[in-house]
């Protein structure tokens, strides 16, 4: 006797159809379908269509949201950090005049020790340990771009608060194009949001690893809390295993 | 003969204990659990205990994420439009000058219309159809917030497009607020991004609804085109059926 | 949500996640895995009763359609809702390695 | 991913998602709904064999873990992954309604 | 900016050889590989090899092994590729093409490639 | 060695219209959920210039009315308003596999 049970196609088609029919009257709310017995003639009014694809069209939009690759998922990712150039390279010297920005540097040959492959690289977090806060502020993140030209990526609106908090800032597609093709020093800046017609656009935000005057015996906790890159890669000889995906089974 | 099943709860229990043994060597590509043998006596060094905190702490801020009520999810959300205000309104005139913003304002009455309870509201969307655009530029959405201040409320980088393309901002929370206590007419802004070091602050993009000297024969479509909120709501008769989410079953 | 909050505070029957923790030590037998000693995995089980059929009497069913089959499926099945991730430290030879995880513990489960 | 592009061009017999088009009309004998007439609402369908014990050579199975159950569940079942929404047009008396259904369409599936 | 600037055209007799060079600026030339590839009169592109300017590591498309030799000169920035035993079917254009960082590199610079046409 | 086959060989459109161009792989070319599929666009007398890196990545400074798509054996390189200064041939390339491939070219005309 066979225990192999044969799946009839057919009967599982019937029951995902029945269980439909439940499903939208049941998002529907109704007991059954609603009668038809005062709809007006003719096509569907102009308004109910164009309204009717502007729906569509948002859902077109959502799907077109590329799917992430399961394989690359699953495996486990090693976790490095690159802690920022400190404050005293030379490379500070020139971005040390503005009261709207600070600067964090990074060496790209430590980000490239941490991850060898721009590729396997699954995810890159910028963390900053922000202090005591006494307003509400609008932060913006600029990654640098070209000699002097900042390119925008991110803002966060921070609200008051008396003890210290991570802030972390999703920089994988920045920290990807810096391992593939960065200079040897790369960075980012952080800024007060300036509004076209706003006049105070200090940054208020005290982030730890650029406050000066600190007592000596804080200096170790400070730099070990300045701001740092979390990476997550999957490593070399582990992406080498994986099958290729032709083959799913 | 009863042909209930008791399930076997300890059965259950070690079959999961078994597979995740296997879930984690597989994510870690090991077919044994690593040798030990050289593994350095003593407690992790602190750099090592510093990541693993860092990782978890990303965790935890990850899962602090609210989950969207699935009993509000599953029921059908009727969909709706309300049209900006037309620009020869008013209200429109204390805010023409500005070469670096468009406004677009709301009559709030015919959103409680559409929505007549504010908790009611899943989703609202303002979408504005831009036209062509030789440069690329970075916008911010504000709200209108109180005389004459505006709340940040999120941005879009708009990359050159030879083609028309409709922008799709998420503005649930401000149109709820609305909603729940908003004036007679409510508005957003939409301006050019301002660095604080850059000059050239002007709005480029040309939104369909503002643009002046059009052909008659196009004023029709372009009015239809022209700026909407798109919203989606469960209808009230809907939500009064709604369980109690006490009682889950 | 068919999540902690709910499901370890109740007696429910139907699909809900069900606690589990995993002692790396004593349920698996592994020393290798210097942190966490052990992690809250979890489980879901429960039935997740086919409600649907041309004989079945709409009204009735349809408070309960959300919960036993709310994605139509031909046999719905209680399956992970939310899941989180899970860090750990472990040796490769004489270096330490901290590695993510992914999918590791549920939080909620769900009928699909 | 166990998804359209795959599953409709492969003879998996494992979980994939499988096409199936519900034509309102024919299929349900609904006039009700004036758009859209139907809609690709596929299912997920499939075996996900339960690959771990003790006694399973640990090496072999480490390549299929993956697919055949990636959340280590004790009975790992095939299950919709991806899902979208669809948007409908049906009158309640004179009055036409646009209406939008949550996670009606299946776009892949998975084993969990 | 990034630049790759290559060595003149080149006239060659048959079973001569030929080195065409590559010199890089504005980028730290070491942190790249660098690949050569061939482009006959009215064909398509192939991949001849690459090279570690840092380490002088080398990959050669099989076809390529006993024609080309790559080299680098770090104190210049510069990279070589000899092409030996020459005959007719080597003439062609030559260019040398920076691979972003990694093993798995594409190519996003290219010089503005070397003609060597060989003629009796 | 990995094949690409590019097809068609030569393709004319006209002006404004949309020219598609495929590479098909002999194997996959992902690693990673990353597809390492490369498009260049050479006019006559001209180095390759870089369009698309990673299937669909854009090039700074190329035009978005070049975009990449497709995965693991099978891509698409899109010219959704096809212009004068378009016309050229294009090469796809992968860099999953030593000896890298390129794919024969296509050669776009205006119709």
């Known amino acids: 006797l066979s225990t192999c049970k044969t799946i009839d196609m057919e009967l599982v088609k019937r029951k995902r159809i029945e269980a439909i029919r439940g499903q939208i009257l049941s998002k529907l709310r109704l007991a059954s379908p609603p009668s038809q017995g005062e709809v007006p003639p003719g096509p569907l009014p102009e308004a109910v269509l164009a309204l009717y694809n502007s729906t569509r069209d948002r859902v077109a939009g959502e799907s077109a949201e590329p799917e992430p690759e399961p394989e690359a998922d699953y495996y486990a990712k090693e976790v490095t950090r690159v802690l920022m150039v400190e404050t005293h390279n030379e490379i500070y010297d020139k971005f040390k005049q503005s009261t709207h920005s600070i600067y964090m540097f990074f060496n790209t040959s430590e980000l490239r020790e941490a991850v060898p492959e721009p590729v396997l690289l699954s995810r890159a977090e910028l963390r900053l340990l922000r202090l005591k806060l006494k307003v509400e502020q609008h932060v913006e993140l600029y990654q640098k771009y070209s000699n002097n030209s900042w390119r925008y990526l991110s803002n966060r609106l921070l609200a008051p608060s008396d003890s210290p908090e991570w802030l972390s800032f999703d920089v994988t597609g920045v920290v990807r194009q810096w391992l593939s093709r960065g200079g040897e020093i790369e960075g980012f800046r952080l800024s007060a949001h300036c509004s076209c017609d706003s006049r105070d656009n200090t940054l208020q935000v005290d982030i730890n690893g650029f406050t000066t005057g600190r007592r000596g015996d804080l200096a170790t906790i400070h730099g070990m809390n300045r701001p740092f890159l979390l990476l997550m890669a999957t490593p070399l000889e582990r992406a080498q295993h994986l099958q290729s995906s032709r083959h799913r089974r | 003969l009863s042909t209930c099943k008791t399930i076997d709860m300890e059965l259950v229990k070690r079959k999961r204990i078994e597979a995740i043994r296997g879930q984690i060597l597989s994510k870690l590509r090991l077919a044994s659990p690593p040798s030990q043998g050289e593994v350095p006596p003593g407690p992790l060094p602190e750099a090592v205990l510093a990541l693993y905190n860092s990782t978890r702490d990303r965790v935890a801020g990850e899962s602090a994420e609210p989950e969207p009520e699935p009993e509000a999810d599953y029921y059908a959300k009727e969909v709706t439009r309300v049209l900006m205000v037309e620009t020869h309104n008013e209200i429109y005139d204390k805010f023409k000058q500005s070469t670096h913003s468009i406004y677009m304002f709301f009559n709030t009455s015919e959103l409680r219309e559409a929505v007549p309870e504010p908790v009611l509201l899943s989703r609202a969307e303002l979408r504005l159809l831009r036209l062509k655009l030789k440069v690329e530029q970075h916008v911010e959405l504000y709200q209108k917030y109180s005389n004459n201040s505006w709340r940040y409320l999120s941005n879009r980088l708009l990359a050159p497009s030879d083609s028309p393309e409709w922008l799709s901002f998420d503005v649930t929370g401000v149109v709820r607020q609305w909603l729940s206590r908003g004036g007679e007419i409510e508005g957003f802004r939409l301006s050019a991004h301002c660095s604080c070091d850059s000059r050239d602050n002007t709005l480029q993009v040309d939104i369909n609804g503002f643009t002046t000297g059009r052909r008659g024969d196009l004023a029709t479509i372009h009015g239809m085109n022209r700026p909407f909120l798109l919203l989606m709501a469960t209808p009230l008769e809907r939500a009064q059926h709604l369980q109690s989410s006490r009682h889950r079953r | 949500a068919l999540d902690t909050n709910y499901c370890f505070s109740s007696t429910e029957k139907n699909c809900c996640v069900r606690q589990l923790y995993i002692d790396f030590r004593k349920d698996l037998g592994w020393k290798w895995i210097h942190e966490p000693k052990g992690y809250h995995a979890n489980f879901c089980l429960g039935p997740c009763p086919y409600i649907w059929s041309l004989d079945t009497q709409y009204s009735k069913v349809l408070a309960l359609y959300n919960q036993h089959n709310p994605g139509a499926s031909a046999a719905p099945c209680c399956v992970p809702q939310a899941l989180e991730p899970l860090p750990i430290v472990y040796y490769v030879g004489r270096k330490p390695k901290v590695e993510q995880l992914s999918n590791m513990i549920v939080r909620s489960c769900k009928c699909s | 991913a166990l998804d359209t592009n795959y599953c409709f061009s492969s003879t998996e017999k494992n979980c994939c998602v499988r096409q199936l088009y519900i034509d309102f009309r024919k299929d349900l004998g609904w006039k009700w709904i004036h758009e859209p007439k139907g809609y690709h609402a596929n299912f997920c369908l499939g075996p996900c064999p339960y690959i771990w014990s003790l006694d399973t050579q640990y090496s072999k199975v480490l390549a299929l873990y993956n697919q055949h159950n990636p959340g280590a569940s004790a009975a790992p079942c095939c299950v919709p992954q991806a899902l979208e929404p669809l948007p409908i047009v049906y009158y309640v008396g004179r009055k036409p309604k646009v209406e939008q259904l949550s996670n009606m369409i299946v776009r892949s599936c998975k084993c969990s | 900016q990034v630049q790759l600037v290559q060595s003149g055209a080149e006239v060659k007799k048959p079973g001569a050889s030929v080195k065409v060079s590559c010199k890089a600026s504005?980028?730290?030339?070491?942190?790249?590989?660098m690949h050569w590839v061939k482009q006959a009169p009215g064909q398509g592109l192939e991949w001849i090899g690459n090279?570690?300017?840092?380490?002088?590591?080398?990959n050669y498309n099989e076809k390529f092994k006993s024609k080309a030799t790559l080299t680098v000169d770090k104190s210049t920035s510069t990279a070589y590729m000899e092409l030996r035993s020459l005959r007719s079917d080597d003439t062609a254009v030559y260019y040398c093409?920076?691979?972003?960082?990694?093993?798995?590199?594409?190519?996003?610079?290219w010089g503005q490639g070397t003609l060597v046409t060989v003629s009796s | 060695d990995i094949v690409l086959t590019q097809s068609p060989d030569s393709l004319a459109v006209s002006l404004g219209e949309r020219a598609t161009i495929n590479c098909r792989a002999s194997?996959?070319?992902?690693?990673?959920?990353?597809?390492?599929i490369q498009w260049f666009q050479q006019k006559p007398g001209q180095p390759p210039k870089l369009l698309i890196y990673?299937?669909?990545n854009l090039e700074t400074g190329v035009p978005d009315r070049f975009s990449g798509s497709g995965s693991r054996t099978d891509f698409t390189l899109t010219i959704s308003s096809l212009q004068a200064e378009d016309v050229a041939v294009y090469y796809c390339?992968?860099?999953?596999?030593?000896?890298?491939?390129f794919g024969g070219g296509t050669k776009v005309e205006i119709k």
């Open positions: 504005g980028y730290t030339f070491t942190s790249y590989w």
């Open positions: 093409a920076r691979a972003t960082y990694g093993s798995y590199g594409y190519f996003d610079v």
């Open positions: 390339l992968q860099s999953r596999q030593i000896p890298r491939t």
């Open positions: 194997e996959s070319v992902t690693i990673i959920g990353t597809n390492l």
């Open positions: 090279i570690n300017p840092s380490n002088g590591d080398t």
């Open positions: 990673h299937a669909s």
